[in-house]
């Protein structure tokens, strides 16, 4: 009788994460009597995967019924494979011993590689908003993929970006890998509706890349432009002054009217109109009772946008007395000045 050999016919086995791996092993003889064990790795630190004689191995099933006579097939299936299962598996025949069985012969090993999909890319932008013409950084992260080869691209509104840096970790061998990329994006006033997209392509995705997005509306701050104008006289002693607040984003805005430096009224932007580019317009008006003023009046529209320092625009009302058929009327002239 020829001495028993342990045959592991597959040098490599490639399995997708979540699938079942079949590791094949046959013995060439029924002699010696004794159980089969499967290990991951070799040497003293090897990990027991299955022991025919004893133990509980819920993820492992044998391909053949080991109790059946003449059985020499010791192949196993390992269910619900994860990247952590990658490694070289050895089928080892033991010889019945007393008190303990003795290792007799090992197969040559089967290297199990696990293909794992990357997680959905997560794109994050800067912690604070930035204004147009500034450059901001976006990061993209994806984890848990294997093998290591992966492709990452950045897009802004469908246009590929080139200013980015990407790292795949760890550098050496690992059961799974992570990718981290940082892209630089220059903001424009039209970017409220813009999107930054991180696209990850991997062998496990069958040509259908994963995408993570960030809306620049979360990142951009478009400061308003102010215009203060005087409307025609509405009543004998009243002048209507409006402050047009244009092209701002986000909506959070507070406006204060000052008469000669004294607060007249404060209000919060509510009924705004939205522009096509996603920015907002708003208008506030102030009725000034001219008869209450002997001297010229400096009206200031002061706007605090999104917690930033206030910007303001001023308007000078010239107050002069004109004789009237009955009593007197006060007229007003205006000049404008812009203060920031």
């Amino acid at each position: 009788e020829e001495e028993l050999q342990v045959i592991q016919p597959d040098k490599f086995v490639l399995v997708a994460a979540g699938e079942t791996a079949t590791l094949r092993c046959t013995a060439t003889s029924l002699i010696p009597v004794g159980p089969i064990q499967w290990f991951r790795g070799a040497g003293p630190g090897r990990e027991l995967i299955y022991n025919q004689k004893e133990g509980h191995f819920p993820r492992v099933t044998t391909v053949s019924d080991l109790t059946k006579r003449n059985n020499m097939d010791f192949s196993i299936r390992i269910g619900n494979i994860t990247p952590a299962d990658a490694g070289t598996y050895y089928c080892v025949k033991f010889r019945k011993g007393s008190p303990d069985d003795v290792e007799f012969k090992s197969g040559a090993g089967t290297e199990l590689s696990v293909r794992a999909k990357p997680s959905a890319p997560v794109v994050s932008g800067p912690a604070a908003r930035a204004t147009p013409q500034h450059t901001v950084s976006f990061t993209c992260e994806s984890h848990g993929f294997s093998p290591r080869d992966i492709t990452l691209k950045w897009f802004k509104n469908g246009n590929e970006l080139s200013d980015f840096q990407t790292n795949v970790d760890p550098v050496g061998e690992s059961v799974s890998y992570s990718i981290h990329s940082t892209a630089k994006v220059v903001l424009t006033r039209e970017d409220v509706h813009s999107q930054v997209i991180c696209e990850v392509a991997h062998v496990t995705l069958q040509g259908d890349p994963l995408r993570g997005t960030a809306n620049l509306s979360e990142t951009i701050r478009v400061p308003p432009t102010l215009e203060v104008t005087q409307q025609p006289v509405r009543a004998e002693n009243q002048v209507n002054v409006t402050c047009q607040v244009r092209k701002f984003y986000p909506q959070r805005l507070q406006l204060t009217w000052l008469e000669n430096g004294n607060v007249s009224r404060t209000e919060t932007a509510s009924t705004v109109t939205e522009n096509k580019d996603g920015t907002y317009n708003w208008m506030s008006w102030l009725l000034v009772n001219v008869s209450a003023h002997r001297d010229d009046v400096k009206l200031t529209c002061q706007v605090e946008h999104d917690g930033q320092p206030a910007v303001s625009k001023s308007h000078d009302l010239k107050v002069s007395a004109h004789p009237k058929e009955q009593g007197s009327n006060t007229a007003a002239e205006n000049t404008g000045s812009n203060e920031r």
């Epitope: 009788e1 029924l30 009597v33 004794g34 025919q52 004689k53 004893e54 109790t67 006579r69 019945k96």
Partner: antibody, heavy 119, light 110 residues
């Protein structure tokens, strides 16, 4: 360490039944056949039957086919052999034995259970 | 059914001498390249102990003075140098089909 611990001695009357137990430890019970063998006083070994605890597949010696029933309880790793319609010539030591190589052989044995059939 | 016949029924051998026990099958027990014969030793008050499996393979812990040989229908258990602790009854068993035992051979010291 494989161990097979059998139930204690029994005295039965002719026509009665006996159920001998064999509790296994030190190995995965469902992975190996259990055989039952008996030995009458001063006589040789006589194979009764065998059972695969994984699926309860059984093989019986034709002599015992109508009177013996093998069962297992995998939750307690225990095998049972029931013999019905006992006769005086069923007086014997009944052994359970585990087949470690699936060769239909007997590698590890229990200590035996003496069943005495006497009126 | 395959019947196994052992010879002799009993045997007395001097210490240090060779003891030979024979087992003949009523038909061949060879199948799938193996001879499905097993030898057991039973000492008084103890269960049997497996000595030899598949005709010629010593079980673990069995002293190498025990050996098995034969093929087809004729098989032999040999104890090359009898020791006092070898006094026992020896049985052959086949599993070419469902198992059966030989009638046993009682080995004593002369």
């Amino acid at each position: 360490q494989v161990q097979l611990v059998q139930s204690g001695a029994e005295v039965k009357k002719p026509g009665a039944s006996v159920k001998v137990s064999c509790k296994a430890s030190g190995y995965t019970f469902t992975n190996y056949w259990i055989n039952w063998v008996r030995q009458a006083p001063g006589q040789g070994l006589e194979w009764i039957a065998m059972i695969d605890p994984s699926d309860s597949e059984t093989h019986y010696n034709q002599i015992f086919k109508d009177r013996a029933t093998l069962t297992t309880d995998t939750s307690t790793s225990t095998a049972y052999m029931e013999l019905r319609s006992l006769r005086s010539d069923d007086t014997a030591v009944y052994y359970c034995a585990m087949d470690y190589g699936s060769l239909y052989a007997m590698d590890y044995w229990g200590r035996g259970t003496l069943v005495t059939v006497s009126s | 059914d395959i019947v196994l016949t052992q010879s002799p029924d009993s045997l007395a051998v001097s210490l240090g001498e060779r003891a030979t026990i024979n087992c003949r099958a009523s038909q061949s027990v060879r199948s799938s390249g193996y001879n499905w014969i097993f030898w057991y030793q039973q000492k008084p008050g103890q269960p049997p102990k497996l000595l030899i499996y598949l005709a010629s393979n010593r079980d673990s812990g069995v002293p190498d003075r025990f050996s098995g040989s034969g093929s087809g229908t004729d098989f032999t258990l040999t104890i090359s140098s009898l020791q006092a602790e070898d006094v026992a009854v020896y049985y052959c068993q086949h599993s070419r089909e469902l198992p059966t035992f030989g009638q046993g051979t009682k080995l004593e010291i002369k």
